[in-house]
């Protein structure tokens, strides 16, 4: 006899990285017929929603109109059908960005390198932080974490054309409070003609704002949140 229902999916729209004072919606997707959804923040009950009619709704949304450092942290959700509760969802790390300062990102030896070259990114921020994060724009939200007093090094190793793309870095004041993003660095890796033509590449984005990137990770996968790559989320833990 089943004692619990399957865990729901949890995600943030437009993204789990939210600029301060901007809005974000936490989504929780359970099953049709769920009469109650609970959102927990840092282990305590944060909000409740009772969908109507429950048999036609399998997803609820919890809206945060004004992101700040107090709202940043770990969220999870559960739902119930009748008296039976679900397993808790995976943890969603909601991060507030655009805090305090802007780091500078540089790449060694440079932004246009030959295939096989060893490439290292350097993220520098002179204010009080010791953790840095390097993100490659794209659907899978590649994230690396680095440490240092004023800078961190992110060695990519010998690069291939698959490393092409746009990178940014953040200083992290704690796991859930990040700096403004650095200016982007676009890495171009040139190889043999055959290699280049076959190279996998993350989707490219309009060069307007960082917000464009913030919209990509989950919205590209909204039809099936089971596919959502938790690389960045897991890294925070």
């Amino acid at each position: 006899q089943q004692q619990t229902l399957p865990k729901p999916f949890i995600w943030a729209e437009p993204h789990f990285m939210v600029p301060k004072e901007k809005q974000v919606t936490i989504c929780c997707q359970g099953n049709y017929g769920a009469v109650e959804y609970q959102l927990h923040f840092e282990g305590s009950l944060f909000a409740v929603d009772r969908p109507k009619p429950p048999e036609r709704i399998n997803k609820v949304q919890f809206y945060i109109p004004d992101m700040n450092s107090r709202m940043a942290g770990q969220y999870s959700c559960i739902y119930r059908v009748g008296e039976l509760w679900s397993e808790p969802s995976n943890l969603l790390d909601l991060v507030v960005t655009e805090m305090y300062d802007t780091p500078t990102l540089s790449v060694h030896p440079g932004p246009e390198v030959i295939s096989g070259e060893k490439v290292t990114f350097y993220c520098r921020l002179d204010t009080a932080t010791s953790m840095f994060l390097l993100l490659k724009e794209g659907r899978s939200s590649h994230v690396q974490r680095g440490y240092g007093k004023v800078q961190a090094e992110f060695p990519l190793g010998p690069v291939t054309t698959a490393h092409r793309g746009t990178y940014r870095c953040f200083g992290s004041y704690n796991n859930h409070a990040w700096s403004f993003p650095s200016e982007p660095v676009k890495l171009l890796v040139t190889g043999d003609i055959e290699n280049t033509s076959l190279a996998p590449e993350d989707p490219t984005f309009p060069a307007d704002t960082w917000g464009t990137y913030l919209l990509t990770t989950e919205t590209g996968l909204q039809k099936d949140h089971a596919l959502w790559d938790h690389t960045a989320q897991n890294l925070l833990r």
């Epitope: 030896p109 440079g110 390198v113």
Partner: antibody, heavy 120, light 107 residues
Framework: QVQLQQPGAELVKPGASVKLSCKAS????????MHWVKQRPGQGLEWIGM????????NYNEKFKSKATLTVDKSSSTAYMQLSSLTSEDSAVYYC?????????????WGQGTTLTVSS | DIKMTQSPSSMYASLGERVTITCKAS??????LSWFQQKPGKSPKTLIY???RLVDGVPSRFSGSGSGQDYSLTISSLEYEDVGMYYC?????????FGGGTKLEIK
Amino acid sequence: QVQLQQPGAELVKPGASVKLSCKASGYIFTSYWMHWVKQRPGQGLEWIGMIHPNSGSTNYNEKFKSKATLTVDKSSSTAYMQLSSLTSEDSAVYYCAREGNWARGYFEYWGQGTTLTVSS
Amino acid sequence: DIKMTQSPSSMYASLGERVTITCKASQDINSYLSWFQQKPGKSPKTLIYRANRLVDGVPSRFSGSGSGQDYSLTISSLEYEDVGMYYCLQYDEFPYTFGGGTKLEIK
């Protein structure tokens, strides 16, 4: 054309500090890593470290971490290396070199070197 | 740190002779190796990078080869202007490290 200009010589006393300069011209200073290399009289070359002029990011040879401090002044396109607590072991020729920004280990341009003499 | 052992430390060769200088790394450096030439009183000049790639403007008599820990610089036919010091540099790992140098003179 690309030039890295360094003063020909510096004479300093033991225990003092010195700030060696490398003025770049003929290219976008902030786009290339600048390296510093030491050569003692009649001896080989030693890599001290490198700095990115745009970000100020650095990478030092551990051996020189407490000896050398690399900085830049973007407004004058000048890279600096400060050497502290000087001893006779620091007497050497110091070169700045611009690395190609598409391949490591390819030092495209070198300064003519500054001969540092530490003597009382 | 990776140690680069260069040999010979000095050598004499005749004009037109084929000259080979070797560099051995204390570990595999994955062909991340450059060769430099330095003439007396002058700054070094890069000849080869990535073990075998010739820098633009460097005469084709210079060539580089090797992999793993063992690398060599060859001058196919020695010319008078080739006299000077030659250094290898590994840049597989920080800190970059140079070989001890080879002094090449005309016999």
